[in-house]
């Protein structure tokens, strides 16, 4: 039977090294065996390159194409082939279809004045155009109460968020995740980072020295927990002092 594309390729670029195209066939397809996506930069002397797609679902194919560090003028010619049959042809401009990389290493640290300090890493090196363009959305949710969640927009430069412990339910377990977007590139949101989980406790920690804190996640009393807090605070300050000098 003839091979047909049901939903034509939709492509996004992380604007540093990879573009990903996804499309849907009209019936279950072994993408890697039956299809090839060729791509070529519209630039004098550019060679034709071939991407072997993989299955995301029975009839959904996805292709990850290595690209050079993208610039605004780059335009790629894309051709989807089933053997010698051209199924679809189109063009793709990475700068107009940006999906940022996922922020990394999301961690939660106790901070002064009963706040939690959420930190993550900018997924782009400083020399990349997107490094200074990213803003973030942080989602904080109660693991046991689906209706107890908060969304924070981080529009300043640093990949950090300070969260008052008192804004969350005491004794509850919370999870946070973060995603990024680049406003000036009119990008889509990145994928969410993996979640990180912590136990919220906002009564003054000093009052609980020697008292057991009901925390099935840690199995420590507050003395042990406080030692960890202090160590993390020192580590964090040292890290930032070191970073400042660079």
């Amino acid at each position: 039977g003839s091979v047909k594309v049901l939903h034509e390729p939709s492509c996004f670029s992380d604007y540093i090294s990879t573009s990903v195209c996804q499309w849907k066939m009209d019936h279950p397809t072994n993408c890697s065996a039956e299809l090839r996506l060729s791509y070529q930069l519209d630039f004098m002397g550019s060679e034709n390159h071939t991407c072997v797609p993989e299955n995301r679902e029975d009839s959904v194919c996805v292709c990850s194409m290595p690209i050079d560090d993208a610039v605004e003028a780059d335009v790629y010619q894309l051709d989807l082939w089933a053997g010698q049959q051209l199924l679809w042809s189109g063009s793709f401009q990475p700068s107009k279809h940006v999906k940022p990389r996922t922020p990394g290493n999301l961690t939660v640290h106790p901070n002064i004045s009963h706040t939690w300090l959420l930190m993550w890493t900018n997924p782009y090196p400083t020399e990349n155009h997107l490094h200074s363009e990213l803003t973030y959305m942080v989602n904080v949710s109660n693991d046991n109460d689906p209706e107890d969640f908060k969304v924070y927009n981080v529009t300043y430069m640093g990949p950090t968020l300070r969260l008052a412990a008192s804004t969350l339910k005491s004794g509850a377990s919370y999870s946070a995740r973060v995603r990024a977007w680049a406003q000036t590139y009119n990008s889509t949101w990145s994928d969410w980072s993996p979640s990180t989980t912590w136990l919220n406790y906002y009564e003054p920690w000093e009052q609980h020295l020697g008292k057991p804190i009901p925390n099935p996640l840690l199995g420590l009393d507050s003395t042990g927990l406080n030692d960890i807090f202090e160590a993390q605070k020192i580590e964090w300050h040292e890290h930032h002092h070191h970073h400042h000098h660079h």
Epitope: L41, F43, M44, G45, S46, E47, N48, H49, P66, I67, D68, V71, E72, A73, D74
Partner: antibody, heavy 125, light 112 residues
Framework: EVQLVESGGDLVKPGGSLRLSCVAS????????MTWVRQAPGKGLQWVSL????????YYADAVKGRFTISRDNAKNTLYLQMNSLRAEDTAVYYC??????????????????WGQGTLVTVSS | DIVMTQTPLSLSVSPGETASISCRSS???????????LDWYLQKPGQSPQGLIY???KRASGVPDRFSGSGSGTDFTLRISRVEANDTGVYYC?????????FGQGTKLEIK
């Protein structure tokens, strides 16, 4: 040492054919696009044609399109220019030159960074 | 096609002086920040051309720092400081951005 040596230039009658060769050495030939540039007697430089490293992409000046064919044999490190239907105005010294690095997604550009010594093509009856 | 226009077409300079040659393109040669696809070549009498400057301002291997390229978009300049007798020849600009590649008419530099 990077070197390009052209050959094949000759005196030919209008309407005739000629094949120029350019043998390369001292660099990874297959990774680079190659270009032909010509210079009519007493005139300036005129670009003729370019071929990508794999040979998959070719480009031509309007003045030679349909008459000239650029090709390469990467196993022999050799660039060719097949010239058919030659005209008096094709009389020139023909130079081959190393152009952009095309093994990357976006070719890396260094200008025409090495030139051959040139070979003279004379089209006259 | 992109048209390349050089000025002046001839230039006479005394040894030790600075020579400047201008090249203007009919459309921008800026592909991305810092990437102007404009080259400068020198053809000495009886020789093949040789590369001097590529991407607007980058010196080709072995080219003395007396040669410098500047400009962006459509206006470019080649400067030769402390001119020497050996610098005599015809200087060409060329755009390498799109097919067909095109050269300027050439500027003949004569040393007094």
């Amino acid at each position: 040492e990077v070197q390009l040596v052209e050959s094949g230039g000759d005196l030919v009658k209008p309407g005739g054919s000629l094949r120029l060769s350019c043998v390369a050495s001292g660099f990874p030939f297959r990774d680079y696009a190659m270009t032909w540039v010509r210079q009519a007697p007493g005139k300036g430089l005129q670009w003729v044609s370019l071929i990508s490293g794999s040979g998959g992409k070719t480009y031509y000046a309007d003045a030679v399109k349909g008459r000239f064919t650029i090709s390469r044999d990467n196993a022999k490190n050799t660039l060719y220019l097949q010239m058919n239907s030659l005209r008096a105005e094709d009389t020139a010294v023909y130079y081959c030159a190393v152009d952009r690095l095309t093994k990357t997604i976006r070719p890396q550009y260094y200008g025409l960074w090495v030139w051959g010594q040139g070979t003279l093509v004379t089209v006259s009856s | 096609d992109i048209v390349m226009t050089q000025t002046p077409l001839s230039l006479s300079v005394s040894p030790g002086e600075t020579a400047s040659i201008s090249c203007r393109s009919s459309q921008s040669l800026l592909y991305s920040i810092g990437y102007n696809y404009l080259d400068w070549y020198l053809q000495k009498p009886g020789q093949s051309p040789q590369g001097l400057i590529y991407l607007g301002s980058k010196r080709a291997s072995g080219v003395p720092d007396r040669f410098s390229g500047s400009g962006s978009g459509t206006d470019f300049t080649l400067r030769i400081s402390r001119v020497e007798a050996n610098d005599t020849g015809v200087y060409y600009c060329m755009q390498g951005l799109q097919s067909p590649l095109t050269f300027g008419q050439g500027t003949k530099l004569e040393i007094k």
